[in-house]
């Protein structure tokens, strides 16, 4: 099967690598622009340059290209505690992450939101926090695991999920009837 | 078993107001962060606004900042969301979930859905 190709991507690919067809002449491959810069005017014919102005600041090109503007680069969003890791540049885009020992939880494909890592007070680190992932925590006896934290079972109330977590001391508590758990 | 319900969807002009319900049952709706996902027709789950457990943060796509607002009422397992300002384009079924923090995105736990309609 053949790939369905946008009508950009085809007339790209009549010309060589690392050039694109002039859009008012097919007959006329010209150069693509470097990164860290756009096109501001096609070339006037074949083996003469592509005009490409360097993007202005806040504004990038990560590869080759033939765009007609730069995009715009990416702001962190410190109300859900991002960092900037290295600010944009011509050819590349703002990097952002978390600051040590917070990880990253996604919301959406490209937005996430920075926590803190699990400390695993009541219990023990089985799996270290990761860049997107909590700390997995193991609770000590006594204790129950809420959202990656270690709770006391004297929080849990009969018919929560903690239950069969906690059903020793439940038990212990409630006195020794049958809670339908095995 | 989670189970999530979700209403309050409906026909609305451009510029209008709404405000979704989901009822929460079989888990302890005040100790997880909860959020509203939508999906248009033909596209994929987006991301629209989240709430911690306390409701002291929440957290809006961009799209719908300043015009959507999430609460909750844990006395009542209820998760809300009120839509003003409603544009064509915030036209899809609406879903509440419940959030499992750590990579994600992730929306396992969603009810059936609302559908909104906003059509002059």
């Known amino acids: 099967l053949v790939p369905h190709l946008g009508d950009r991507e085809k007339r790209d690919s009549v010309c060589p690598q690392g050039k694109y067809i002039h859009p008012q002449n097919n007959s006329i491959c010209c150069t693509k622009c470097h990164k860290g810069t756009y096109l501001y005017n096609d070339c006037p014919g074949p083996g003469q340059d592509t005009d490409c102005r360097e993007c202005e600041s806040g504004s990038f090109t990560a590869s080759e290209n033939h765009l007609r503007h730069c995009l715009s680069c990416s702001k962190c969003r410190k109300e859900m505690g991002q960092v900037e890791i290295s600010s944009c540049t011509v050819d590349r885009d703002t990097v952002c992450g978390c600051r040590k020992n917070q990880y990253r939880h996604y919301w959406s494909e490209n937005l996430f939101q920075c926590f803190n890592c699990s400390l695993c007070l009541n219990g023990t680190v089985h799996l270290s926090c990761q860049e997107k992932q909590n700390t997995v925590c193991t609770c000590h006896a006594g204790f129950f695991l809420r959202e990656n934290e270690c709770v006391s079972c004297s929080n849990c109330k009969k018919s929560l999920e903690c239950t069969k977590l906690c059903l020793p001391q439940i038990e212990n508590v409630k006195g020794t009837e049958d809670s339908g758990t095995t | 078993e989670v189970q999530l319900l979700e209403s309050g969807g409906g026909f609305v002009q451009p510029g209008g107001s709404l405000r979704l319900s989901c009822a929460a049952s079989?888990?302890?709706?005040?100790?997880?962060?909860m959020s509203w996902v939508r999906q248009a027709p033909g596209k994929g789950l987006e991301w629209v606004s989240a709430?911690?457990?306390?409701?002291?943060?929440?957290y809006y796509a961009d799209s719908v900042k300043g015009r959507f607002t999430i609460s909750r009422d844990n006395s009542k397992n209820t998760l809300y969301l009120q839509m003003n300002s409603l544009r064509a384009e915030d036209a899809s079924v609406y879903y509440c979930a419940k959030v499992k923090l750590g990579g994600g995105p992730n929306f396992g736990y969603r009810g059936q859905g609302t559908l909104v309609t906003v059509s002059s």
């Open positions: 709430i911690s457990g306390s409701g002291g943060s929440t």
């Open positions: 079989g888990f302890t709706f005040e100790w997880y962060w």
